[in-house]
C-alpha cells in the first residue's frame, strides 16, 4: 500500500491522543534505555510503511502484536485516514485470523514495540517531510 495520500495530521492526532499511550502501557515496567533503536524512517509515508509492517507482520520471537490495543487503533487510524487502505488489508486480516495465537508478551515483543515507538516519534517530528 502507498501511504502517500493519507491524512497525516489526522493520523498524528490519533497517535498523540491514544496510540502513544497504549504503546507506553504495553511497555510499562521497561526502561526506556533497555532497547536500541535499529530502524528509523525518512518521511511520513515511509514511517507509516514501516509502522504497518512492524505492527502487523509476525517476526522471530514475536508472533503477533496485531491484537494489542495500540495495533487495533493503528489499523483503525490507517483505515479511516488512508484512502483505500482497508481494501488492501482484507486478505491479510483473513490470514492473520487463521494463525492467531495466545497473547504472550515476550522480550522480543517489547523490543519490537520499542522500535515502533521510535518510528511513531519520527513520524510525529514537525520537520518531517510529508512525502
Amino acid at each position: 500500500y502507498d501511504f502517500t495520500n493519507c491524512d497525516f495530521e489526522k493520523i498524528k492526532a490519533a497517535y498523540l491522543s491514544t496510540i502513544s499511550k497504549d504503546l507506553i502501557t504495553y511497555m510499562s515496567g521497561t526502561k526506556s534505555t533497555e532497547f536500541n533503536n535499529t530502524v528509523s524512517c525518512s518521511n511520513r509515508p515511509h514511517c507509516l510503511t514501516e509502522i504497518q509492517s512492524l505492527t502487523f507482520n509476525p517476526t522471530a520471537g514475536c508472533a503477533s502484536l496485531a491484537k494489542e490495543m495500540f495495533a487495533m487503533k493503528t489499523k483503525a487510524a490507517l483505515a479511516i485516514w488512508c484512502p483505500g487502505y482497508s481494501e488492501t488489508q482484507i486478505n491479510a486480516t483473513q490470514a492473520m485470523k487463521k494463525r492467531r495465537k495466545r497473547k504472550v508478551t515476550t522480550n522480543k515483543c517489547l523490543e519490537q514495540v520499542s522500535q515502533l515507538q521510535g518510528l511513531w516519534r519520527r513520524f510525529n517530528r514537525p520537520l518531517l517531510k510529508q512525502q
Epitope: T38, V39, S42, N43, S53, L54, T59, Q115, K129
Partner: antibody, heavy 117, light 108 residues
C-alpha cells in the same frame, strides 16, 4: 562486530539475471536493522538499490524497482539480490550493507559484476 | 529526485591542513544527511549522520555541519590516512536516497 560478505558470479550476460548473496556474521539479520544493496559503477558514484528490514519490509529504488528483487534466508543469515534484464550499464561493484533504513553503517567489501557477452 | 552536488570535485592539500568539503541538495533535506569516506579498493565507511553526528569510532577531527540545502564536512587537520574520496548522501526523500558524485581529497 557485524561483518558482511558478498558472493556471486562476476560475469553475467546481457538480458540475464544478476544474482548475489550477502552472508552476515556477528549479527542476526532477523534481530534488527535493515539489510541493503548499493552499487558503484567503475569510476563513478554510489547508487542505492534497496533494502529488506529485519521484520521483512522491502523498499526499492524507484529507478530499479521493476527489475529488482531482494529476499532473505534467516536460517542461513543471508540476504540476496536479483536484478533482471541486465545491460552493460549494470556493470558495477555491488555492496551489501547494514542500514537503519536511512544510512549505512557497515559494509561488505564489494564484488565486481561485469555484464558482457 | 533530490540531486546532491559536491564541490570541489578534487581538493589538493597537504597533511596537517584543514579540508572543507561542500555538499548541496537541490531541495531541503533538513538534517537528513550522511557523509562517507572511501579509499581505493575499499567499501565506503560512515563518518557522519544527521548532518553533524559522528559515527562510532570516527576521530574528532571529522565534523559535519549544515541544514536544509547546504552542508559541510570539515577535516580539521589532515592525516595521511584521510586522503580518499568523500560522498554525501541524503535520506530525506524515501524511496529515492541519493548520493553526491564525490570529492577526492588528494595529496598536494
Amino acid at each position: 562486530q557485524v561483518q558482511l560478505q558478498e558472493s556471486g558470479p562476476g560475469l553475467v550476460k546481457p538480458s540475464e539475471t544478476l544474482s548475489l548473496t550477502c552472508t552476515v556474521s556477528g549479527y542476526s539479520i532477523s534481530s534488527g536493522y535493515g539489510w541493503s544493496w548499493i552499487r558503484q559503477p567503475p569510476g563513478k558514484g554510489l547508487e542505492w538499490i534497496g533494502y529488506i528490514s529485519y521484520y521483512g519490509s522491502i523498499s526499492y529504488n524507484p529507478s530499479l524497482k521493476s527489475r529488482v528483487t531482494i529476499s532473505r534466508d534467516t536460517s542461513k543469515n543471508q540476504f540476496s539480490l536479483k536484478l533482471s534484464s541486465v545491460t552493460a550499464a549494470d556493470t558495477a561493484v555491488y555492496y551489501c550493507a547494514r542500514t537503519n533504513l536511512l544510512y549505512f553503517d557497515s559494509w561488505g567489501q564489494g564484488t565486481l559484476v561485469t555484464v558482457s557477452s | 529526485e533530490i540531486v546532491m552536488t559536491q564541490s570541489p570535485a578534487t581538493l589538493s592539500l597537504s597533511p596537517g591542513e584543514r579540508a572543507t568539503l561542500s555538499c548541496r541538495a537541490s531541495q531541503s533535506v533538513s538534517n537528513n544527511l550522511a557523509w562517507y569516506q572511501q579509499k581505493p579498493g575499499q567499501a565506503p565507511r560512515l563518518l557522519i549522520y544527521d548532518a553533524s553526528s559522528r559515527a562510532t569510532g570516527i576521530p574528532a577531527r571529522f565534523s559535519g555541519s549544515g541544514s536544509g540545502t547546504d552542508f559541510t564536512l570539515t577535516i580539521s587537520s589532515l592525516e595521511p590516512e584521510d586522503f580518499a574520496v568523500y560522498y554525501c548522501q541524503q535520506y530525506s526523500d524515501w524511496p529515492q536516497y541519493t548520493f553526491g558524485q564525490g570529492t577526492k581529497v588528494e595529496i598536494k
